[in-house]
Amino acid sequence: QGGTRSPRCDCAGDFHKKIGLFCCRGCPAGHYLKAPCTEPCGNSTCLVCPQDTFLAWENHHNSECARCQACDEQASQVALENCSAVADTRCGCKPGWFVECQVSQCVSSSPFYCQPCLDCGALHRHTRLLCSRRDTDCGTCLPGFYEHGDGCVSCPTSTLGSCPERCAAVCGWRQMF
C-alpha cells in the first residue's frame, strides 16, 4: 500500500523527482519525457529528440524538445556547429567577418550580425590585431607609405612630387619647394 510522501525522493542514485504519485528518474539530455515512471523510483519513458530539435540538460518535465535555431542569413550568419540532440546550432560569422552586436550590453545570446573585417593591407597599414570577435585593428602605414589625414599615402617616386615633413621623415625625401 502507498506510503506517505517525503519532501525529497528516497531513491538510490541522483536525479529523481516526484512526478505525480512517484519519484521518477529524469530523462537524459537529448531526450524528452514521453511518460513519467509508473512505480516508485522508476525510470520515466524517454524518447530521443526528433531531428532539428534538442534538449541540452537532463530534465523531468520537458514533454517536447526545443526547436533548433536557424542562423540568420540576412545578418550574414553561418552555422559554426550544427544542431544535435543535446545542443542548439551555434551561429557565428565566416572567416574574414566579425560579430557586431545589436544591443549595447552584449552577451552570448544577444542578437548579432556579421560585418566584413577591415582589410588593413588594402588601407596600406600593418595589421595590429587580427579580426575575430571584433574588427581588425590596423596599425601604422606600411613601408613606402606615410600618414596623411586619415589615410596612408604612397611615397612619391620622383622629386617632382611634393613631400611634406611627415613624408620626408618616412620616405627619406627632403621637403621640396
Epitope: G20, A35, E39
Partner: antibody
C-alpha cells in the same frame, strides 16, 4: 486518438464475482500506469486501484483490498478488474483511466449493479 | 488518508459571472492537485493538473491556483456549457482521494 472502452458490467448478486475489461488504443499502453475509479449512483468519484506499466506494482483502496484484483495484458492493450465477494455498496459505474496522478484519459464507464 | 474538502457543494450563477470553488486538503499536498469537470452521464474530464496547469484544449476561462492545503478553481466568465459537477483530486499520496464535488447550475 486515445480511447479507453470498458466492458463486463452487469447485475450480480451479493457475494458474486464479475470481471471488468478496459480495451486501450491510440497510445503506447505499456508505458502508462492505469487505474479503476468508480462512482456510485448520484455520488462522487472514488479511486479504487492502480497498476504500474509493467504490472509489477499494484495499489488498492481499503474498501476493495482483498476482494478486487487489478491486472493488465500489455500484449493485448487490456486492463482488467476481477471483483469477488461483491457487496451492495460496490454498485457503481466503473471507469478505467490512464495516468499516475492526474487522470488524463477516461473510458465511458460500465455499470455494475449488486443486488439480490 | 488525505481528506479533500470542497466548497460549496452546489452553486447557482449567471452566464458571464466569475465562479470560484475551493478545495482544502487535510495535510500538505504541495501542488499535486487536479480539477475535473463531469457532465451528466459522461466520464470526468481533466481540466487542470499540478494545481494550476491548464490541460491542452481547455478554454482559458478556467484557472487554478494554490499550494500546500488550500486551492482555488475559477471560471472567469461562466458559459452555458460549463454546467457540470467539478471535482478536485489529490495525487500526492496513495490512496488518491477526491473532493465530494461542486454542482454548478445556471440561475
Amino acid at each position: 486518438e486515445v480511447q479507453l472502452v470498458e466492458s463486463g458490467g452487469g447485475s450480480v448478486q451479493p457475494g458474486g464475482s464479475l470481471r471488468l475489461s478496459c480495451a486501450a488504443s491510440g497510445f503506447t499502453f505499456s508505458s502508462y500506469g492505469m487505474n479503476w475509479i468508480r462512482q456510485a449512483p448520484g455520488k462522487g468519484l472514488e479511486w479504487i486501484t492502480y497498476i504500474s506499466s509493467s504490472g509489477g506494482h499494484t495499489y488498492y483502496a481499503d474498501s476493495v483490498k482483498g476482494r478486487f484484483t487489478i491486472s493488465r495484458d500489455n500484449a493485448k492493450n487490456s486492463l482488467y478488474l476481477q471483483m469477488n465477494s461483491l457487496r451492495a455498496e460496490d454498485t457503481a459505474v466503473y471507469y478505467c483511466a490512464r495516468g499516475q496522478g492526474p487522470f488524463e484519459y477516461w473510458g465511458q464507464g460500465t455499470l455494475v449493479t449488486v443486488s439480490s | 488518508d488525505i481528506v479533500m474538502t470542497q466548497s460549496p457543494s452546489s452553486l447557482s450563477a449567471s452566464v458571464g459571472d466569475r465562479v470560484t470553488i475551493t478545495c482544502q486538503a487535510s495535510q500538505d499536498i504541495t501542488n499535486y492537485l487536479s480539477w475535473y469537470q463531469q457532465k451528466p452521464g459522461k466520464a470526468p474530464k481533466l481540466l487542470i493538473n499540478d494545481a494550476s496547469n491548464l490541460e491542452t484544449g481547455v478554454p482559458s476561462r478556467f484557472s487554478g491556483s494554490g499550494s500546500g492545503t488550500d486551492f482555488t478553481f475559477t471560471i472567469s466568465s461562466l458559459q452555458p456549457e460549463d454546467i457540470a459537477t467539478y471535482y478536485c483530486q489529490q495525487y500526492d499520496t496513495l490512496p488518491i482521494t477526491f473532493g465530494q464535488g461542486t454542482r454548478l447550475e445556471i440561475k
